[in-house]
């Protein structure tokens, strides 16, 4: 609704917040959440499982402002940082620093972005410049990806980059088409 106050070239109108889901209450800066893929069923043999769906991934909620040159978003956005190793769901610690990460012997499972959302942000600029609006790509969920020795270095490097920091915006994408999507679990005001 705050958009109405600006003489912008595009105006976004969001219905009353009560009508639509808000971000879950834990979406504050640097909170963590453990999330098990496929319902988090614990493996029958936790140290021998080879099914990626049996592994859980640590998601760090991160709140930041979007910047574009001297302009900054009017409101912070919340996205996920996919963090650390993946391990059997029931062996993962509930918080950073509590216990040690379980490392599978053999293939390496990495926590990487799975799904994104395109969120529109209003950018306020200094010096009387008119506000602008754009969409940014934000990480919405993470997954465990099995890496083997056959993965090349560039792929490993990309995973490391994705896991280490939040997405600033839009990154180069492979050319394949997306599969049919599932409903978003994370949604901000925009």
């Amino acid at each position: 609704q705050g958009w109405q106050a600006f003489k912008n070239d595009a105006t976004e109108i969001i219905p009353e917040l009560g009508e639509y889901p808000e971000p879950p209450p834990e979406l504050e800066n640097n909170k963590t959440m453990n999330r098990a893929e496929n319902g988090g069923r614990p493996p029958h043999h936790p140290f021998e499982t080879k099914d990626v769906s049996e592994y859980s991934c640590r998601e760090l909620h991160f709140t930041r402002y979007v910047t574009d040159g001297p302009c900054r978003s009017a409101k912070p956005v919340t996205e996920l940082v996919c963090s650390g190793q993946c391990g059997p769901a029931r062996l993962l610690p509930n918080a950073i620093g509590r216990g040690k990460w379980w490392r599978p012997s053999g293939p390496d499972f990495r926590c990487i972005p799975d799904r994104y959302r395109a969120q529109r942000v209003q950018l306020l600029c200094p010096g009387g410049e008119a506000p602008r609006a754009r969409k940014v790509r934000l990480v919405a969920s993470c997954k465990c990806k099995r890496l083997t020795r056959f993965h090349n270095q560039s792929e490993l490097k990309d995973f490391g980059t994705e896991a280490a920091r939040p997405q600033k915006g839009r990154k180069p994408r492979p050319r394949a088409r997306s599969a049919k999507a599932n409903q978003a679990e994370l949604e901000n005001a925009y």
């Epitope: 109108i13 219905p15 972005p113 959302r117 395109a118 529109r120 990154k171």
Partner: antibody, heavy 125, light 111 residues
Framework: EVQLQQSGPELVKPGTSVKMSCKAS????????MNWVKQSHGKSLEWIGD????????TYNQKFKGKATLTVDKSSSTAYMQLNSLTSDDSAVYYC??????????????????WGQGTSVTVSS | DIVLTQSPASLTVSLGLRATISCKAS??????????MNWYQQKPGQPPKLLIY???NLESGIPARFSGNGSGTDFTLNIHPVEEEDAVTYYC?????????FGGGTKLEIK
């Protein structure tokens, strides 16, 4: 298969309004923004605005603010655009086109990758 | 608004040769390392069809004779080798900033 099926042509009188529809199928409706684009006869394309079916948020090109109203019906996976106070300048073909809201990393999320066939609107007395 | 200027407005190319269409933006459409320029093809009586997204990425199902490049404010669409069915209209479109805007179009003719 992704499909956007738009309603049929409209012949309307000046000063009235018209409401056209765009029924989506073949994908999860709430995972994509629905954009609306105007193409006047023999001319280029103009982005009218978009609506996010997930949360109902709408964004309008300032040029079309007050002229167009975007809505959705999630239960039928249908997007609607109403045009008000019609004049001859509103005679055009109007397209709906999706862009991605919730997606994996392998899509052209910042482009309109599927389009409806268009709804022709003729404003004449 | 970001203004996109396409040139030429019309272009005639011999069958099998290369067609190059230019699109210049009134300000940069780059953000965080990516360029937010898309290219569409429109045949008469049909809706536009996405060819290239993010300046250089070929959309799924589009023939490899279509390619795009550029960054900042200057972008090009290349078609090589040109085929008869390519004789239609092409539009560039920026998605870097609201409102999304389109170029004026380039009509390609084959001789």
């Amino acid at each position: 298969e992704v499909q956007l099926q738009q309603s049929g042509p409209e012949l309307v009188k000046p000063g009235t309004s018209v409401k056209m529809s765009c029924k989506a199928s073949g994908y999860t409706f709430t995972d994509c923004y629905m954009n609306w684009v105007k193409q006047s006869h023999g001319k280029s394309l103009e982005w009218i605005g978009d609506i996010n079916p997930f949360n109902g948020g709408t964004t309008y090109n300032q040029k079309f603010k007050g002229k167009a109203t975007l809505t959705v019906d999630k239960s039928s996976s249908t997007a609607y655009m109403q045009l008000n106070s019609l004049t001859s300048d509103d005679s055009a073909v109007y397209y709906c086109a999706r862009s991605h809201y919730y997606f994996d990393g392998r899509v052209p999320w910042d482009a309109m990758d599927y389009w409806g066939q268009g709804t022709s609107v003729t404003v004449s007395s | 608004d970001i203004v996109l200027t396409q040139s030429p407005a019309s272009l005639t190319v011999s069958l099998g040769l290369r067609a190059t269409i230019s699109c210049k933006a009134s300000q940069s459409v780059d953000y965080d390392g990516d360029s937010y320029m898309n290219w569409y093809q429109q045949k008469p009586g049909q809706p536009p069809k996405l060819l290239i997204y993010a300046a250089s990425n070929l959309e799924s199902g589009i023939p490899a004779r279509f390619s795009g490049n550029g960054s900042g404010t200057d972008f090009t669409l290349n078609i090589h080798p040109v085929e008869e069915e390519d004789a239609v209209t092409y539009y560039c479109q920026q998605s870097n900033e609201d409102p999304w805007t389109f170029g004026g179009g380039t009509k390609l003719e084959i001789k």
